[in-house]
Amino acid sequence: MAVTACQGLGFVVSLIGIAGIIAATCMDQWSTQDLYNNPVTAVFNYQGLWRSCVRESSGFTECRGYFTLLGLPAMLQAVRALMIVGIVLGAIGLLVSIFALKCIRIGSMEDSAKANMTLTSGIMFIVSGLCAIAGVSVFANMLVTNFWMSTANMYTGMGGMVQTVQTRYTFGAALFVGWVAGGLTLIGGVMMCIACRGLAPEETNYKAVSYHASGHSVAYKPGGFKASTGFGSNTKNKKIYDGGARTEDEVQSYPSKHDYV
C-alpha cells in the first residue's frame, strides 16, 4: 500500500513539476526590468527565452520574437537546450510511469517489469528536474553578471551632458517557477526510485531451500535432473521463495511456493 502511495505521489509531483517546467519555458518573464534605483520610465521591459516584450504604462504590450538563431548568445541557446531536454525527458518519464503505476494493470505485466519502468521514469524525472534547475540557474547567473556590468556604467555620459537610461534586468517570475518546478520533478523522481525498491522482487530472503547430502553441495529440483548450487543466480526467476504472504499479482507472476525441493 505504501509503495503504491509513494509511486502515485511521485507521479503526481513529477506531473506538476513537468507542467511547471513547460510553463516556465514558455513564459516571457525570465528577466524583468529592474525598477529599483532606475529613473521611473513609462515603459516596462521583460524578456523570455523566445521573445522580448515591452509593456507601456498605457497598457499596450508589444512582443518581438528572437527570429535569429545564430545571433543569440550561446548561454541563451544552452538554457533553451537544457529546458527542452528537461521537458522531453520529463514527458517520456511521464509516459513510462503511467504504465509502471501499480494501480494500473496492463495484461500480465510482471512486478519486476513495473519496478524497472518505475526506476527508469524516476531517473528520467531526476535528470529532467536537474536540467530545469541547471537551465534556470545558468540564466540567473547570466542575469547577475549582466546586472553588475550595467550597474558599473548605469549612465553612460555623452559629452557629460546627456544621460542614457541603461535598462538593467533582474530575476523574472519564470525563474522562480522553473526552480520550484525543477525541484518538484526531482522530488517526484526520487519518490519513484524509492517506490521502485518496494516494487522490486526481493533477492535476499530465500533463494531456495537446499538439502545438503553428505559430501555434496547440490540442490535437487523436482521435474528434471538439472542441478544448481543453492546460492547461484537464477536468471529466470530471481525470487523463488519469500516465505511470506503474496498479492494476487505475485501468485500469478512468480513460481508457486511449492516449487522448492
Epitope: 529613473p39 513609462a42 515603459v43 499596450f60
Partner: antibody, heavy 117, light 113 residues
Amino acid sequence: QVQLKESGPGLVAPSQSLSITCTVSGFSLTSYGAHWVRQPPGKGLEWLGVIWAGGSTNYDSALMSRLSISKDRSKSQVFLKMTSLQTDDTAMYYCARSLYGNSFDHWGQGTTLTVSS
Amino acid sequence: DIVMTQSPSSLTVTAGEKVTMSCKSSQSLFNSGNQKNYLTWYQQKPGQPPKLLIYWASTRESGVPDRFTGSGSGTDFTLTISSVQAEDLAVYYCQNNYIYPLAFGAGTKLELK
C-alpha cells in the same frame, strides 16, 4: 466615437482648491491611461499627471504635493484635484487618453480655469 | 527632471516649402527592449486642443498626411514637413513619453510669410 469632456468651476479664488472632471465615452478607462495637461494663456503645454488603466498614478514633480488624480470607472470619469491655487494656475485644462507609445491620441476640448480674487 | 528643447521657437515659411524643426531631450528616449524612441509630435492650431501627429518618433498617426515625417533617435529628433500647406500653420510640440515627468517642449510656431 471616442470623446473626452472636461468640466470645471471656471473661476476660483487664490489659495482655494479645485476639482475638474473629465467624462469619457467611446472607450473604457480600464483599458486606457487618462492624462491631465494644462496650457496657460499664450504659453506652451504642461503635463500635470496621469492615471493609468490599472489605477496607478504619476505626477509632475513640481506639482506633486498639490495634485491628486482619481477615477470612477463605473461613471467613466477622471478627476483632477488641485490645492492651494495661485494666479499662475490660470490656464486651459485638458484631459487626454493614451495608448500606443504612451502618446495622447484623443484630447478633450478643455476647460478654462481662472484663479482670481 | 528631463528637459525638452525645441528649436527654432518660430519659423516663417512660404507655401510649398520644406520645413524641419528640431527637438532635443536631456536624456535618451530610446528603449532597448523594443528598439523604439518614445518621442511624440503634436500639432496645435489656435483655439483647438493639440492633435497627435507622430508617435514612437517616426510612426505617423492614422489620418495624418504623409508630408509629415518624424526622424531621429536617442536625444535628437526632427519633424519634417516636405511641402508646407496653409492648413499646416500651427504650433508644433514634441513630448517625452518615456521618463517621468512626461514633459513637453516649448513649441515651434509655424507662420506664413
